[in-house]
């Protein structure tokens, strides 16, 4: 423990103001009262302190609140938040969405830092679930946030929160994550009419089962190729040529350009060449005429 130096005469800080930027580190340590700092934290961001000076101020807060800062201080940390470690943040109890927003604003435009990840984790755990307002806030700052969660974590997202999700929020989600999100989206949007429903559900279809794709094919949805290519291969394989044609509508012509890529490639291998020829796209690789198709998966299920 460093020996405490007395504050020079006339330098005791009566308030947190800009004159403090001229204080040396030891003067800040000696002349700024931690309780005063805590009550006037909102002023710190309006003063051009150096990193060394900010370290002193942080140290004073750490001494005042060894068990973790109260939310009244956390909300006004501003750029001092960037000096916090994940270990510091794990001591906090952040319950207000306004506090979360204030700290995310500080990190706006940057990659999600370990500090931010810890803050979000503490906040969400404190709330018990990822409610709509929280999800709205997090995806506004970090569009990829949803896809950074594990399937287990995603299971705590209530269907009502799905309304906050934008298509770009799902760009980096893998099939396992979409498997969890799709049923929630289906539930959330169930009362919408056909075309509106498709617009909302489209981004989640990477988690859709075969029967739902079959149902969509009856609704003239005209799915684009980009969406089709993100569908689960196991969900696409059982679809007939007629069903895929109805599902894609005018976009069916795009199958030719994707015939070597999954799931199109695997789907072609499962179709009769005769049926593929009806599309007039020159798709090759289907089952030759006269061959018998055995569904081994069905056979295994029966035995």
């Amino acid at each position: 423990e460093v020996e405490k130096t007395a504050c020079p005469s006339g330098k005791k800080a009566r308030e947190i103001d800009e004159s403090l930027i001229f204080y040396k580190k030891w003067e800040l340590e000696a002349c700024v009262d931690a309780a005063l700092l805590a009550t006037q934290m909102d002023r710190v961001n309006a003063i051009p302190f150096t990193y060394e000076q900010l370290d002193v101020l942080k140290h004073k807060l750490d001494e005042l609140y060894p068990q973790g800062y109260p939310e009244s201080v956390i909300q006004h940390l501003g750029y001092l938040f960037l000096k916090m470690s994940p270990e510091d943040i794990r001591k906090w109890n952040v319950t207000s969405l306004e506090t979360l927003k204030a700290l995310l604003e500080v990190n706006k435009g940057h990659e999600m830092s370990p500090q931010v990840a810890t803050l979000i984790d503490r906040f969400v755990k404190g709330r018990g679930q990822l409610d709509k307002d929280t999800l709205d806030t997090l995806t506004a700052f970090y569009p990829g946030y949803l896809c950074s969660l594990s399937p287990e974590e995603l299971s705590s997202v209530p269907p009502s929160s799905i309304w906050a999700v934008r298509p770009q929020d799902l760009d980096t989600c893998d099939p396992r994550q979409l498997d969890v999100l799709y049923p929630k989206a289906r539930l959330a949007f169930q009362n919408m009419n056909g075309s509106e429903y498709f617009v909302k559900i489209q981004s989640f279809l990477g988690g859709a089962p075969t029967e739902d794709l079959k149902a969509l094919s009856q609704q003239n949805v005209s799915m684009d190729l980009a969406t089709f290519m993100k569908l689960r291969t196991d969900a696409v394989l059982p679809l007939t040529v007629a069903e895929v044609q109805k599902l894609l509508g005018p976009h069916v012509e795009g199958l030719k350009a994707e015939e070597r890529h999954r799931p199109v490639r695997d789907w072609i291998l499962r179709q009769r060449q005769d049926d593929l020829d009806t599309l007039g796209l020159g798709l090759q690789g289907g089952i030759p005429n006269g061959y018998l198709v055995l569904d081994l998966s069905m056979q295994e299920a029966l035995s």
Partner: antibody
């Protein structure tokens, strides 16, 4: 109204000393810091340092530390920038500016310093 | 020894909008609120246009606006006018160094 009036242009020889001034009026001089900014011919702005006139506390850019001295006389609401030994590379326009919570809101008209043998 | 990076020049026609970027690091632009923008006409002193990243001093037209994302600050001028033709400088506080730093300046030409 707020005004910062700087001393006139100077022509000096290398090795000579110089002190230029910046007089504030229309506001409480001790309530605001004064910064100094250099602009070499045809170039951009460079921050040199700042002073709190109330206590004469100063902070310098590392590039100018030891090269110049910033001072103030609050009794006559004037800030100063001085050199003990000028160099040809000190030839520039020098501006004083009042610092106001996040930006420099009022500027002097500038003092052109020419150092030439 | 320019700390903040600005494009050397930008241009636009009257009535158009233009944006000037100012890129720094997490130590300056990205690490605090202290970003300001200055306009300088030839032979004149700089004039403060934006401070605290997005605040406008009284008397500055609302056609000028500031914003920041990550380590990049931006000045946007909408409804470009002939009198906007000038040099524009960004400035930020460098907390590790304890000093103010300027960008290299951007010459705005109104076509």
């Amino acid at each position: 109204q707020v005004q910062l009036v700087q001393s006139g242009a100077e022509v000096k020889k290398p090795g000579e000393s110089l002190k230029i001034s910046c007089k504030g009026s229309g506001y409480s001089f001790t309530n605001y810091w004064i910064g100094w900014v250099r602009q070499m011919p045809g170039k951009g702005l460079e921050w040199m340092g700042i002073i709190d006139p109330r206590e004469s506390f100063t902070r310098y850019s590392p590039s100018f530390q030891g090269q110049v001295t910033i001072s103030a006389d609050k009794s006559i609401s004037t800030a100063y920038l001085q050199w003990s030994s000028l160099k040809a590379s000190d030839t520039a326009m020098y501006y004083c500016a009042r610092y106001m919570k996040g930006g420099y809101d009022y500027w002097g008209q500038g003092t052109l310093v020419t150092v030439s043998s | 020894d320019i700390a903040l990076t600005q494009p050397a020049s930008v241009s636009g026609s009257p009535g158009q909008s233009i944006t000037i970027s100012c890129t720094g690091t997490s130590s300056d632009v990205g690490g605090n609120n202290f970003v300001s923008w200055y306009q300088q006409h030839p032979g004149k002193a700089p004039k403060l246009m934006i401070y605290y990243g997005d605040s406008r001093p009284s008397g500055v037209s609302n056609r000028f606006s500031g914003s920041k994302s990550g380590n990049t600050a931006s000045l946007t001028i909408s409804g470009l006018q002939a009198e906007d033709e000038a040099d524009y400088y960004c400035q930020s506080w460098d907390a590790p160094m304890g000093m103010w730093v300027f960008g290299g300046g951007t010459k705005l030409t109104v076509l």
